[in-house]
């Protein structure tokens, strides 16, 4: 019963249009096109949107005219491939237009970067901001979205036009207000946040669609919505999981208009269908469109029925467990994993999705043996260690966090990351042992009942991270096993790797340890990255520097660098004290 | 007090649809497997089916296709939808609980009353 | 799957010791699921046994269960004037779809 079918139209452009409206339209062929084209200037995409919506409009007018009849793939695929420098910039991306559709999609897909090397945005100052945002206010938010698109060729285009909305009232309401940059700059630093967070949790729903496929996806969504509706039926929460998986699979797959199109339609059904679904829905669904979805994405749990009965009844007491899961395996283990997950909003959503697969191979194996029962009669005493794990190492890090602060529990991050994978590119051990760091902040203040599932799935983005980064460009086999094998052992998989003893210490080079008064100018946070980043290069120097050694040399480098930049001669002071501070630390490290 | 009262039973025509309600009171409805049993005048019991506490239902195979059970949890009710019915299908029908929670047992320790189906033209 | 039970109809006397078996036509489910049941004129059937030994919960300790496998019996050991009543066996199978119910024996007074 998905809510998605249509008449078949003629035109799918037209139909696409007169759905979403010519703003959002127009907005949407922008994200996908930036997506794609990620090099592309501004102005280049921006005639290329023109032209499409043109064309939509002439196919509103008449859905027999010329070329209307074609898909959307086509249509965007034959305006992409008229770009004229697409050989120079995008190299063997070019190849892609001598193919034909579903295949030059496909090969559009696979030529999105991750990590583009594009020069990181900076923001000027709050009245050039302003006057430019008067001056042309359509232009101002459309540059918003090509250089958000371009660098997160993943993030969720219905989502990215919530972020425009609130970007487009930051700026509305601030550049009236008295103090600008004091009301303007705290919204931009959110959504800045926000949005970050956003593309990090939409690529791996991506990843776990394209690497893992839908099945994992499905199981994923089953074990969430459960855990947000646990009063909504099994039968309501799989049309929710069928028609979640149809709305994301079209957004990663580059059809931003149908994703778009078929979330607002989820939205839609799910606010006319609330009393079956959760009671929590009432003031998200008073909302206008954009942030209606929004939030019911991030919709608190409801509250969980009174007297669920014992889930070892149907799935270990029964008789009949073995008949069931033959009968219709994926919807007996989605049975489970919607009762399981219903009840447990206390664990993450891949701690449920472990224990629904240590079940499956339990069933497996018992439905073949001579007693089933007696096989499978104790498979809920094999969940203990899986639950005991990610809860230990959660109160474990919390200590630590907070013991440690944030800056410093990321540097015991960095070291211990660094010691796993000494192979991977600094700036990205760096990246994402920053961002592991912060799940101290953002979880260890949560009660117990609201740790895990905040923590281990916030983790799962991170590594979801090092993974697509690390696939670009493969240096270490065991980021590889841990990113390919299971997407739900992920972080396990990463937790139990040791120092790797094969690693080769990397050569000593004085430049890495040479800084310069620059730094002295920049902001706290990245002092940090400056920072971090040595100590980075230390444990490669050194993979097997104690805790103590490399607390030593970086306590006399934050030493170094406040004293430097106290000093009248700055640049001096960094030169020589800098020789000496790398001495030192070669002397300290033994290297 | 822990009872079961039937209810939904009366004349129906051969061919019509009759759906009968079974109302439980002094426990959760979701805490064991409920059952279906009638028996026709003069004769003996006759298994229907169950429902168990995770919502899965098992049915006798003549009764298969045509019978459904389900249940409302906020109601604390149970159901049994019939449809096609036919002459021989006129008996008293029983809701009862069961022992187990998964499965049937056959094991009923609580038994409603019973509500009279009549199908004839 | 059958359950037979036999005789179908018995007369005995107060404080007779009365014997009805029941037989399936396969092994009930772990061997034991058996249960047997009284059911007087115009009242729901009772529950007095089940997994084929245990007695349900305020019945009378005159009433026992014993078998095994496809072969089960009830005993009354001394009959009392309030037993006399139709009791059937009810079986549980290796599937919930198979429960099934014995055609009923009649124990009527002498």
């Known amino acids: 019963r998905g809510v998605f079918r249509r008449d078949a139209h003629k035109s799918e452009v037209a139909h696409r249009f007169k759905d979403l409206g010519e703003e959002n339209f127009k907005a949407l062929v922008l994200i996908a096109f930036a997506q794609y084209l990620q090099q592309c200037p501004f102005e280049d995409h921006v005639k290329l949107v023109n032209e499409v919506t043109e064309f939509a409009k002439t196919c509103v007018a008449d859905e027999s005219a010329e070329n209307c009849d074609k898909s959307l793939h086509t249509l965007f695929g034959d305006k992409l491939c008229t770009v004229a420098t697409l050989r120079e910039t995008y190299g063997e991306m070019a190849d892609c237009c001598a193919k034909q559709e579903p295949e030059r999609n496909e090969c559009f897909l696979q030529h999105k970067d991750d990590n583009p090397n594009l020069p990181r945005l900076v923001r000027p100052e709050v009245d050039v901001m302003c006057t430019a945002f008067h001056d042309n206010e359509e232009t101002f938010l459309k540059k918003y979205l090509y250089e958000i698109a371009r660098r997160h060729p993943y993030f969720y285009a219905p989502e990215l036009l919530f972020f425009a909305k609130r970007y487009k009232a930051a700026f509305t309401e601030c550049c009236q207000a008295a103090d600008k940059a004091a009301c303007l700059l705290p919204k931009l630093d959110e959504l800045r946040d926000e949005g970050k967070a956003s593309s990090a949790k939409q690529r791996l729903k991506c990843a776990s669609l394209q690497k893992f496929g839908e099945r994992a996806f499905k199981a994923w969504a089953v074990a969430r919505l459960s855990q947000r509706f646990p009063k909504a039926e099994f039968a309501e929460v799989s049309k929710l999981v069928t028609d979640l998986t149809k709305v994301h699979t079209e957004c990663c797959h580059g059809d931003l208009l149908e994703c778009a199109d078929d979330r607002a339609d989820l939205a839609k059904y799910i606010c006319e269908n609330q009393d079956s679904i959760s009671s929590k829905l009432k003031e998200c669904c008073e909302k206008p469109l954009l942030e209606k979805s929004h939030c019911i994405a991030e919709v608190e749990n409801d509250e969980m029925p009174a007297d669920l009965p014992s889930l070892a009844a149907d799935f270990v007491e029964s008789k009949d467990v073995c008949k069931n899961y033959a009968e219709a395996k994926d919807v007996f283990l989605g049975m489970f994993l919607y009762e399981y997950a219903r009840r447990h909003p206390d664990y993450s959503v891949v701690l449920l999705l472990r224990l629904a697969k240590t079940y499956e191979t339990t069933l497996e194996k018992c439905c073949a043996a001579a007693d089933p029962h007696e096989c499978y009669a104790k498979v809920f005493d094999e969940f203990k260690p899986l639950v005991e794990e990610p809860q230990n190492l959660i109160k474990q890090n919390c200590e630590l966090f907070e013991q440690l602060g944030e800056y410093k529990f990321q540097n015991a991050l960095l070291v211990r990351y660094t010691k796993k994978v000494p192979q991977v590119s600094t700036p990205t051990l760096v990246e994402v042992s920053r961002n592991l760091g912060k799940v101290g902040s953002k979880c260890c203040k949560h009660p117990e009942a609201k740790r895990m599932p905040c923590a281990e799935d916030y983790l799962s983005v991170v590594l979801n991270q090092l993974c697509v980064l690390h696939e670009k460009t493969p240096v270490s086999d065991r980021v590889t096993k841990c990113c390919t094998e299971s997407l739900v052992n992920r972080r396990p998989c990463f937790s139990a790797l040791e120092v790797d003893e094969t690693y080769v210490p990397k050569e000593f080079n004085a430049e890495t340890f040479t800084f310069h008064a620059d730094i002295c100018t920049l902001s706290e946070k990245e002092r940090q990255i400056k920072k971090q980043t040595a100590l980075v290069e230390l444990v490669k120097h050194k993979p097997k520097a104690t805790k103590e050694q490399l607390k030593a040399v970086m306590d006399d480098f934050a030493a170094f660098v406040e004293k430097c930049c106290k000093a009248d001669d700055k640049e001096t002071c960094f030169a020589e004290e800098g020789k000496k501070l790398v001495a030192a630390s070669q002397a300290a490290l033994g290297l | 007090e822990v009872q079961l009262v039937e209810s939904g039973g009366g004349r129906v025509q051969p061919g019509g649809s009759l759906r009968l309600s079974c109302a439980a009171s002094?426990?959760?409805?979701?805490?064991?497997?409920m059952g279906w049993v009638r028996q026709a005048p003069g004769k003996g019991l006759e298994y229907i089916g169950i429902?168990?506490?995770?919502?899965?239902?098992y049915y006798a195979s003549w009764a298969k296709g045509r019978f459904t059970i389900s249940r409302d949890n906020s109601k604390n009710t149970l159901y049994l939808q019939m449809n096609s019915l036919r002459a021989e299908d006129t008996a008293t029908y029983f809701c009862?609980?069961?022992?187990?929670?998964?499965?049937?047992?056959?094991?009923?320790?609580?038994w409603g009353q019973g509500t009279q189906v009549t199908v004839s033209s | 799957i059958q359950m037979t039970q036999s005789p179908s109809s018995l007369s005995a006397s107060v404080g007779d010791r009365v014997t009805i078996t029941c037989r399936s036509s396969?092994?009930?489910?772990?061997?034991?699921?058996l249960s047997w049941y009284q059911q007087k004129p115009g009242q729901p059937p009772k529950l007095l046994i089940y997994?084929?030994?245990d007695l349900a919960s305020g019945v009378p300790s005159r009433f026992s269960g014993s078998g095994s496998g496809t072969d089960f019996t009830l005993t009354i050991s001394s009959l009392q004037p309030e037993d006399f009543a139709t009791y059937y066996c009810?079986?549980?199978?290796?599937?919930?779809?198979?429960?099934?119910f014995g055609g009923g024996t009649k124990l009527t007074v002498l």
């Open positions: 009862a609980r069961d022992r187990h929670g998964g499965d049937s047992s056959g094991a009923f320790y609580l």
């Open positions: 002094g426990f959760s409805l979701s805490s064991n497997a």
């Open positions: 429902i168990s506490v995770g919502g899965f239902t």
């Open positions: 396969e092994s009930v489910y772990s061997n034991n699921q």
């Open positions: 997994d084929a030994s």
């Open positions: 009810a079986g549980g199978f290796s599937s919930s779809s198979d429960t099934a």
